[in-house]
Interface confidence: low
């Protein structure tokens, strides 16, 4: 039975050209996390954090994605095209799969000044 829950940073915004941390946290379960997948709105994989293999950033994102902190992901050099949904998928044993959703809005610099409250500390 799956007892865990995924907590995410929810809806966030960040400046064009800046960076943002995408973060999910799995709680309320003793299940072992075997792998975390990070994917974009079109189901393209950004990165995988495998318990055995460590991090793998996919080639299309190597220049702009940094692993961490923790099981999170740092997206750099943001463009307007980065706006959209991001999903963290936790593969666990024995529970199975948990998935969380984050919506990122990339704003022009002038607009972003008024949206700092959405930024991750």
């Amino acid at each position: 039975m799956m007892t865990g829950t995924i907590e995410t940073t929810g809806n966030i915004s960040a400046k064009k050209g800046g960076s943002v941390i995408l973060q999910c946290h799995l709680s309320s379960t003793m299940a072992q996390v075997t792998q975390v997948n990070w994917e974009q709105h079109d189901h393209s994989l950004l990165a995988i954090r495998n318990a055995e293999l460590g991090w793998h950033i996919y080639p299309a994102f190597k220049d702009r994605v940094a692993p961490g902190p923790g099981l999170g992901l740092t997206l750099q050099s943001l463009t307007m095209n980065d706006t959209g949904e991001y999903f963290c998928t936790y593969h666990t044993y024995p529970d199975g799969t948990y998935r969380g959703r984050i919506f990122l809005e990339v704003l022009e610099s002038s607009v972003a000044e008024h949206s700092a409250r959405f930024q991750i500390p």
């Epitope: 792998q35 189901h43 994989l45 995988i48 495998n50 055995e52 293999l53 793998h56 080639p59």
Partner: antibody, heavy 119, light 107 residues
Framework: EVQLVQSGAEVKKPGASVKVSCKAS????????MHWVRQAPGQGLEWMGR????????KYNEKFKTRVTMTRDTSTSTVYMELSSLRSEDTAVYYC????????????WGQGTLVTVSS | DIQMTQSPSSLSASVGDRVTITCRAS??????LAWYQQKPGKSPKLLIY???TLAEGVPSRFSGSGSGTDFTLTISSLQPEDFATYYC?????????FGGGTKVEIK
């Protein structure tokens, strides 16, 4: 143009080892993981493992873990797959395949290397 | 480990036919599915990834659908060059299993 060129066919005796090479060109060699997939005569495709040419980190299918070694030479943009303790059921075509940009699917394949194990 | 099951294992069709091949995963794999075409004596060729994204240079008569455990490859109007064996593959994590293949033959 991305190209993966593999070494030629091999005939080996049971118990021997074989080392197949795969020379990559047309892209940044260290940016893409390289995988090996084999296909026995008239059979389907079987993933053997992969190597990260940037760090030499590798991951093998449990089935082959004790017998396979994948290495690379960045100076020649070549990856190698060595399979030891060969048996007749290892007779197959061995392919190197480059991972795609958005997942562990394979967007470019080598032409294949037939390895025949026979006494 | 995840297992991929394809059906049918073979089918006979005529040029112009609409052909559907199915692939079932033993557990939820979301959209992490690729399809390949392989002709005798040749290397496999990528057709589709992420369940529905057409690979570069692949004709639009090929399409993919599905998510979770059930997936479909459709060829809207079979052409002479489409007679081949088709494989599905789970493409996230480890190991990376392929389906057993579906051979599309001329009727």
């Amino acid at each position: 143009e991305v190209q993966l060129v593999q070494s030629g066919a091999e005939v080996k005796k049971p118990g021997a080892s074989v080392k197949v090479s795969c020379k990559a060109s047309g892209y940044t060699f260290t940016n893409y993981w390289m995988h090996w997939v084999r296909q026995a005569p008239g059979q389907g495709l079987e993933w053997m493992g992969r190597i990260d040419p940037d760090s030499t980190g590798s991951k093998y299918n449990e089935k082959f873990k004790t017998r396979v070694t994948m290495t690379r030479d960045t100076s020649t943009s070549t990856v190698y797959m060595e399979l030891s303790s060969l048996r007749s059921e290892d007779t197959a075509v061995y392919y190197c395949a480059r991972e795609g940009a958005y997942g562990y699917y394979f967007d470019y394949w080598g032409q294949g290397t037939l390895v025949t194990v026979s006494s | 480990d995840i297992q991929m099951t394809q059906s049918p294992s073979s089918l006979s069709a005529s040029v112009g036919d609409r052909v559907t091949i199915t692939c079932r995963a033993s557990e939820n794999i979301y959209s992490y599915l690729a399809w390949y075409q392989q002709k005798p004596g040749k290397s496999p060729k990528l057709l589709i990834y992420n369940a529905r994204t057409l690979a570069e240079g692949v004709p639009s008569r090929f399409s993919g659908s599905g998510s979770g455990t059930d997936f479909t490859l459709t060829i809207s109007s079979l052409q002479p060059e489409d007679f081949a064996t088709y494989y599905c593959q789970y493409h996230s994590g480890s190991p990376l299993p392929f389906g057993g293949g579906t051979k599309v033959e001329i009727k």
